[in-house]
């Protein structure tokens, strides 16, 4: 279930975790049902709060993603402190509305209070039904 | 369903602008992609541009770049292609359809776009 993510930030992340994605195959994202993520990140700063953002970007068009909850603290326990690792486990309710497509670039980012935490580009996904 | 109707289109000279317009009969802002396609006769339907819902990003086709300029109105439920340096290439018939992947139910009628001298 380990997927290969490019890091967009300075190598925090440790793994990528999605069920039933594997390395750098196509990883896909089902309309109207739920998808699941699992990452672990090592925190490069002290931080109390810790947000989500995720853009996806579909046949190269950047679009919103929405139902996402960006506190990332309802799915870790913050504070973080500096050098240590944390498991975040996050699910997305894809809604049924979705864009279909097979080219789909997705890039999740973790902020901390002084910036960047943890930021990762998934570029093998694709929605379908 | 959602019906959408394109209107806007005409005869106009190489050089000239047109402004087309693409009314839906429903909210589109739940849409998170919309696009403008065209069709000459004997080619394949192509994409001319698309625009996301809520942040307004948009994506055009290399022919059309610096030309046209797509844009939508939630609360109005309409989309607009603006069509400025139009040029004989652009004669098409355009529609309107949800990006990326178009739903045949959605293809209305188009709108006829002719440049010509």
């Known amino acids: 279930d380990q997927v290969d993510v490019k890091d967009c930030a300075n190598h925090e992340i440790k793994k990528v975790l999605v069920p039933g994605c594997h390395g750098s195959e196509p990883c896909i994202i089902h309309r109207g049902k739920p998808f699941q993520l699992e990452a672990v990140f090592e925190a490069n700063q002290n931080t109390k709060t810790a947000k989500i953002e995720i853009k996806a970007s579909i046949d190269g068009l950047e679009v919103d993603v929405p139902g996402i909850d960006p506190n990332a603290c309802h799915y870790m326990k913050c504070p973080l402190v500096k050098g240590q690792q944390y498991d975040i486990k996050y699910t997305w309710n894809v809604p049924k509305i979705a864009p279909k497509s097979e080219n789909v670039v997705v890039t999740v980012k973790v902020m901390g209070d002084d910036g960047v935490l943890a930021c990762a580009i998934a570029t093998h996904a694709k929605i379908r039904d | 369903q959602v019906q959408l109707v394109e209107s806007g289109g005409g005869l106009v000279q190489p050089g000239g602008s047109l402004r087309l317009s693409c009314a839906a009969s429903?909210?589109?802002?739940?849409?998170?992609?919309m696009g403008w396609y065209r069709q000459a006769p004997g080619k394949k339907r192509e994409l001319v541009a698309a625009?996301?819902?809520?942040?307004?990003?948009?994506k055009y086709a290399d022919s059309v770049k610096g030309r046209f300029t797509i844009s939508r109105d939630n609360a109005e439920n309409t989309m607009y292609l603006q069509m400025n340096s139009l040029k004989p290439e652009d004669t098409a018939v355009y529609y309107c359809?949800?990006?990326?992947?178009?739903?045949?139910?959605?293809w209305g009628q188009g709108t006829q776009v002719t440049v010509s001298s």
């Open positions: 359809n949800v990006f990326p992947r178009p739903v045949q139910g959605y």
């Open positions: 429903r909210s589109i802002d739940r849409f998170p992609a």
């Open positions: 625009i996301s819902s809520a942040n307004t990003r948009t």
